[in-house]
């Protein structure tokens, strides 16, 4: 018999507003798994250590995905 | 402006079950956790549960583990509790709360609330 | 017996400074942010300050919030008649249920 599990997201709340990527101090994303059925990305903003959920599926933060592995690849030897 | 309206408070005898509504404006209600809070009569706040934005993630209070049940429809802008087992200790006025939006979760917007008398 | 807290009542006359402290522990004040809320009598709460030492539009700058540790202050400067009120800190904890714990609460009275 299966153990029941409790769903443990982080994300209560999520934002669908856009973020400036110089604003942003670190993006974490974190997979879907076996405790969080959905991607959940958290931003941490450089203004306050603010900590802010994003929503996958809003075209502003896919741009910002984007934006972010695109900065990322230019830093990459 | 955020507006939240909780509906469904009334008299109800011990083990009987109450279910109370709360009608969310102002704001984009899809995105935002919400909370349940009560205050028993003369006491302070005591925090019930939370529903996350999708209505995947629910955490409870011990004390209402097990009997009552955090809900929402997000098409209709509403927010559920369902109170089933109900106690003399359960008497309280019930809040609905919007979250704060950033981690970790809060409270910001209040609603005016709705009286729950759990009485023989 | 809340899990935040704080003493029941202080006082102070219009224009002194009452401070409220607010004690948790490691799994709530020690590693999130608090919040405080201020309750008029016979209203519903207000959010006063949050993430600690934010004002949210509209709240008077005589009202200041810090933290350290696993505790936290309220600070009232200039106290006014209107500042007669319940104040209650919270706090999300990360102890093995999630969820979110309050302070019993401080009533302020303005002799």
């Known amino acids: 018999v299966p153990l029941s599990r409790t769903v443990r997201c982080t994300c209560i709340s999520i934002s669908n507003q856009p973020v400036n990527p110089r604003s942003l101090e670190k993006l974490e994303i974190i997979p879907a798994s076996q405790f969080c059925p959905r991607v959940e990305i958290i931003a941490t903003m450089k203004k306050k250590g603010e900590k802010r959920c994003l929503n996958p599926e809003s075209k502003a933060i896919k741009n910002l995905l984007k934006a972010v592995s695109k900065e990322r690849s230019k830093r990459s030897p | 402006q955020v507006q939240l309206v909780e509906s469904g408070g009334g008299v109800v005898q011990p083990g009987r079950s109450l279910r109370l509504s709360c009608a969310a404006s102002g704001f984009t209600f899809s995105t935002y956790g919400m909370h349940w809070v009560r205050q028993a009569p003369g006491k302070g706040l005591e925090w019930v549960a939370v529903i996350s934005y999708d209505g995947g993630t629910k955490y409870y209070a011990d004390s209402v583990k097990g009997r009552f049940t955090i809900s929402r429809d997000n098409s209709m802008k509403t927010l559920y509790l369902q109170m089933n087992s109900l106690r003399t200790e359960d008497t309280a006025v019930y809040y609905c709360a919007k979250d704060l939006g950033d981690l970790p979760p809060g409270l910001d917007y209040w609603g005016q609330g709705t009286m729950v008398t759990v009485s023989s | 017996q809340s899990v935040l807290t704080q003493p029941p009542s202080a006082s102070g006359t219009p224009g002194q400074r009452v401070t409220i402290s607010c004690s948790g522990s490691?799994?709530?004040?020690?590693?999130?942010?608090v919040n405080w809320y201020q309750q008029l009598p016979g209203a519903a709460p207000k959010l006063l300050i949050y993430t600690n030492n934010q004002r949210p539009s509209g709240v008077p700058d005589r009202f200041s919030g810090s933290k350290s540790g696993t505790s936290a202050s309220l600070a009232i400067s200039g106290l006014q008649s209107e500042d007669e009120a319940d104040y209650y800190c919270?706090?999300?904890?990360?102890?093995?249920?999630?969820?979110?714990?309050f302070g019993g609460g401080t009533k302020v009275t303005v002799l």
């Open positions: 919270a706090a999300w904890d990360d102890s093995s249920e999630p969820r979110v714990v």
């Open positions: 490691s799994s709530n004040i020690g590693s999130n942010t």
